[in-house]
């Protein structure tokens, strides 16, 4: 059965300077391949976080993603700024062989509203 990516919150509001959690769960880790978070859609979308070992300032995973059966790919964004406003998508990829990874499923998106302090 096809993997499903769930982002339960349609939107979240956070005060500038605070932190917020963006929730994402998947129903399967197969086919093998990374899960990444993006802001925006299309060609201009911005990679926000990838669960592939790299360091991303201000962002960290919420659950222990080193568990081999982990299905929770939620992230915490710290010290939120107005520039962080936008819609965030949790995306499951299938690893490519000699080509780039292939996007196979995206969550419905979570809109982040940043409120003035």
């Amino acid at each position: 059965t096809e993997v499903k990516v769930t982002q339960p919150e349609k939107s979240v509001s956070v005060a500038a300077g605070d932190s917020t959690i963006l929730n994402c769960t998947v129903t399967s880790l197969l086919p093998v391949g990374p899960i990444r978070w993006y802001r925006g859609v299309g060609q201009s979308r911005l990679l926000i976080y990838s669960f592939t070992g790299e360091h991303f300032p201000r962002i960290r995973n919420v659950s222990d993603t080193t568990k081999r059966n982990n299905m929770d790919f939620s992230i915490r964004i710290s010290n939120v700024t107005p520039e962080d406003a936008g819609t965030y998508y949790c995306v499951k990829f299938q690893r490519g062989s000699s080509e780039p990874d292939t996007e196979i499923q995206s969550g419905g998106g979570t809109e982040v509203y940043v409120l003035a302090k």
Epitope: T52, D64, T65, T66, K67, R68, N69
Partner: antibody
Framework: DVQLVESGGGVVRPGESLRLSCAAS????????MSWVRQAPGKGLEWLAG????????YYIDSVKGRFTISRDNPKNSLYLQMSSLTAEDTAVYYC???????????WGLGTLVTVSS | SYELTQPPSVSVSPGQTARITCSGG??????YAWYQQKPGQAPVTVIH???KRPSDIPERFSGSSSGTTVTLTISGVQAEDEADYYC???????????FGGGTKLTVL
């Protein structure tokens, strides 16, 4: 620099127990899953067990389930392998290895030799 | 569970290209890596995540995959590359790691 140093190997008799340790340095130990791999003399590599970064989840190859226990102490940057009911077939060099995000291995210790002999 | 199959030995002249294959995994659920081991030494990771090379590994080492077969390619082989090479796999279906039997690379 990432460093993994195993200790605790030695000569034991069949049926006895042994506890191996792996001291980690040069990286944030509590952020990485870890594994134990062994290599019998003149043979290939055999994965034995893995443990999640937080230590709550463990995984074993069927042949050592119930006999070997993997654990970790994150404040001490240490990984352990408790082995019991040892047999001659457990004679090998035991390596600890750091896992990548997808549970392959990127760094290995130098190994510690366990000899089970009467 | 699955088995990874490698040729027992591969021979190549210095400067030539060596290719070591590994088959038997399920591409849908398995990630692959390659580990180099010289006599009396610990393994060293030369490729992980199918084709990712650690920063301290020479560029002549590369990994690729096609279907259920993965390949370690060593371009411009040097005498120091003589070693045993193990294919390793992680199966996301069973949560188990597996190694191939190893391939002895001889530089003629």
């Amino acid at each position: 620099d990432v460093q993994l140093v195993e200790s605790g190997g030695g000569v034991v008799r069949p049926g006895e127990s042994l506890r191996l340790s792996c001291a980690a340095s040069g990286f944030t130990f509590s952020s990485y899953a870890m594994s134990w791999v062994r290599q019998a003399p003149g043979k290939g590599l055999e994965w034995l067990a893995g443990i999640s970064a937080g230590g709550s989840d463990t995984y074993y190859i069927d042949s050592v389930k119930g006999r070997f226990t993997i654990s970790r102490d994150n404040p001490k940057n240490s990984l352990y392998l408790q082995m019991s009911s040892l047999t001659a077939e457990d004679t090998a060099v035991y390596y600890c290895a750091r896992e990548t995000w997808n549970h392959l291995f990127d760094y290995w210790g130098l190994g510690t030799l366990v000899t089970v002999s009467s | 569970s699955y088995e990874l199959t490698q040729p027992p030995s591969v021979s190549v002249s210095p400067g030539q290209t060596a290719r070591i294959t590994c088959s038997g995994g399920d591409y849908y659920s398995t990630y692959y890596a390659w580990y180099q081991q010289k006599p009396g030494q610990a393994p060293v990771t030369v490729i992980h995540s199918d084709d990712k090379r650690p920063s301290d590994i020479p560029e002549r080492f590369s990994g690729s995959s096609s279907g259920t077969t993965v390949t370690l390619t060593i371009s411009g082989v040097q005498a120091e590359d003589e070693a045993d090479y193990y294919c390793g796999g992680y199966d996301g279906r069973t949560y188990i790691n597996t190694f191939g039997g190893g391939t002895k690379l001889t530089v003629l």
